[in-house]
């Protein structure tokens, strides 16, 4: 912590300028007026402070507003942001998109997942909902943010804001996200033909179902191998080798050189050797033919 | 060793069909998917498409589709690709390749096809 | 259909430097879960069929000297040969197996000084 000292007569602070530069930490503790700081945070960024005297000018600003800073400070802290961590972070309230931008661009090119995530976080709670200008803002200045985003807060997207989420935006998402997301995408796309459908419900389809997945290989729809492997494990193992051939289309060679991660290696396992030979790539590891197949979770329900 | 063997050339007719010939050896033929390429003289290569042995199930490149039919013969371990209405566009040189899993392991020394009345 | 870019077209180099080439698609072509690029790159000698160099675009196939080296992910790709030799003398192509159709770059014309 910045120690405490009385501001020399002829360096006090009336207006937050370049001057600033020259004063060393403490006289910047006792100098500068945390209200005067607040009122022209603008100025702040356009001065080449170092990091030491940042970590100054925040003390200041936590000492004034302990319960979290007010969007008007909020919107210019430029490279004060990131001093910022999540805990401080989750305190603000912001609303602006404006503000979401102006920190967006701030954050490219540090490693400050953690801190755009709680930004994002509390601008849908500010918000009241992931609406389609949050999410062209994030799209644009973040790819891949929305991900950043729990299960809880996606499930506030309205279907008709789903069309505005490109592929690259859903790189990052996990099993859960999709879950929630993979519903309102079949919703919003539910009018497009085949093969428009399929173009855009791909990159959700790792929330879909097992009866959506065998839905998908009556269409013709030649999934790639990277979307086949995003699908939830549990959608994948009750497909048959024939189900899978029809849905990979071409790319059902690709197995081969994937077989060892999931889910293809379990699916491959659940599979008559009979039937794998069909695909013409040598897959092995599936049930020899003659070997009964009994599901003992049936005989438990029946006893 | 892995051997793909392609007749050298073929002289068609505009309007008529050919049927590409490769002969595979050194490998189970019904393991490894066959594919096809086209390169025109001096030009980029182009994935017509592939096929599967075991089953003869094939797939083409949707430019290639009123082009192409690609087969197979397990018992002579050959894969063929006819091609119909032939112009002075698919005078080209015709490659099959053996697949690696998905990119092309081995290829043949392809044929060369060349349109002309 | 997924474009790939290759640049440059091509260039003339000495024996023993270093040449890198590039080769751009125009979406991602990394398996998110497996972690494999699904791109391939090939080697083709004057009067000859292509043969690969290199898949998943960095693991070497088997024969191939190791001064062939396959770089990138995502959609930046590089093909560096480290100490350039005579018999490199050929155009280099690239090739995405991610999705169907599989397309090529239009390839590289290295020559030899």
């Known amino acids: 912590d910045v120690e405490r000292t009385t501001c020399p007569p002829e360096k006090e602070v009336h207006e937050i300028d370049e001057s600033l530069i020259f004063y060393k930490k403490r006289e910047l503790e006792a100098c500068v007026d945390a209200a005067l700081l607040a009122a022209q945070m603008d100025r702040v960024d356009a001065i080449p402070f170092t990091y030491e005297q940042l970590d100054v000018l925040k003390h200041k600003l936590d000492e004034l507003y302990p319960q979290g800073y007010p969007e008007s400070v909020i919107r210019h802290l430029g490279h004060l942001f990131l001093k910022m961590s999540p805990e401080d972070i989750r305190k603000w309230n912001v609303t602006s998109l404006e503000t979401l931008k102006a920190l967006l661009k701030v954050s490219k090119g540090h490693e400050m997942s953690a801190q755009v995530a709680t930004l994002i976080d509390r601008v849908v709670v500010g918000r009241g909902q992931l609406d389609k200008d949050t999410v062209d803002t994030l799209t644009a200045f973040c790819p891949g943010c929305l991900c950043s985003l729990s299960p809880e807060r996606l499930s506030s997207v309205p279907p008709s804001v789903i069309g505005a989420v490109r592929p690259q935006d859903l790189d990052t998402c996990g099993p859960r996200q999709l879950d929630v997301l993979y519903p309102k995408a079949r919703l919003a796309f539910q009018n497009m033909s085949g093969s428009e459908y399929f173009v855009k419900i791909r990159p959700f389809l790792g929330g879909a179902p097992t009866e959506d997945v065998k839905a998908l290989s009556q269409q013709n729809v030649s999934m790639d191998l990277a979307t086949f492997m995003k699908l939830r494990r549990e959608a994948v193992l009750p497909l048959t080798v024939a189900e899978v051939q029809k849905l990979l289309g071409p790319h059902v060679e690709g197995l081969k050189v994937e077989e060892q991660h999931s889910p293809v290696r379990d699916w491959i396992l659940k599979q008559r050797q009979d039937d794998l030979d069909t695909l013409g790539l040598g897959l092995q590891g599936g049930i020899p033919n003659g070997y009964l197949i009994l599901d003992l979770s049936v005989r438990e329900a029946l006893s | 060793q892995v051997q793909l063997q392609q007749p050298g050339t073929e002289l068609v007719k505009p309007g008529a069909s050919v049927k590409l010939s490769c002969k595979a050896s050194?490998?189970?033929?019904?393991?490894?998917?066959m594919h096809w390429v086209k390169q025109r003289p001096g030009q980029g290569l182009e994935w017509i498409g592939n096929?599967?042995?075991?089953?003869?199930?094939?797939y083409y490149n949707e430019r290639f589709m009123s082009k192409a039919k690609m087969t197979v013969d397990k018992s002579s371990s050959t894969a063929y690709m006819q091609l119909s209405s032939l112009t002075s566009e698919d005078s080209a040189v015709y490659y099959c390749?053996?697949?690696?899993?998905?990119?092309?392991?081995?290829w043949g020394p392809g044929t060369l096809v060349t349109v002309s009345a | 259909d997924i474009v790939m870019t290759q640049s440059p077209s091509s260039l003339a180099m000495s024996v023993g430097q270093k040449v890198t080439m590039s080769c751009k698609s125009s979406?991602?072509?990394?398996?998110?879960?497996?972690?494999?690029?699904?791109l391939a790159w090939y080697q083709q000698k004057p009067g000859q069929s292509p043969t690969l160099l290199v898949y998943?675009?960095?693991t070497r196939e088997s024969g191939v000297p190791d001064r062939f080296i396959g770089g990138g992910s995502g959609t930046d790709f590089t093909l560096t040969i480290s100490s350039v030799q005579a018999e490199d003398l050929a155009d280099y192509f690239c090739?995405?197996?991610?999705?169907?159709?599989?397309?090529f770059g239009g390839g590289t014309n290295l020559e030899i000084k």
């Open positions: 096929i599967n042995p075991s089953s003869g199930d094939s």
């Open positions: 998943f675009a960095s």
């Open positions: 090739q995405q197996h991610y999705r169907t159709p599989y397309t």
């Open positions: 050194g490998y189970t033929f019904t393991n490894y998917w």
């Open positions: 390749a053996r697949s690696g899993g998905l990119w092309l392991a081995f």
């Open positions: 979406q991602t072509l990394l398996n998110s879960v497996s972690q494999n690029n699904y």
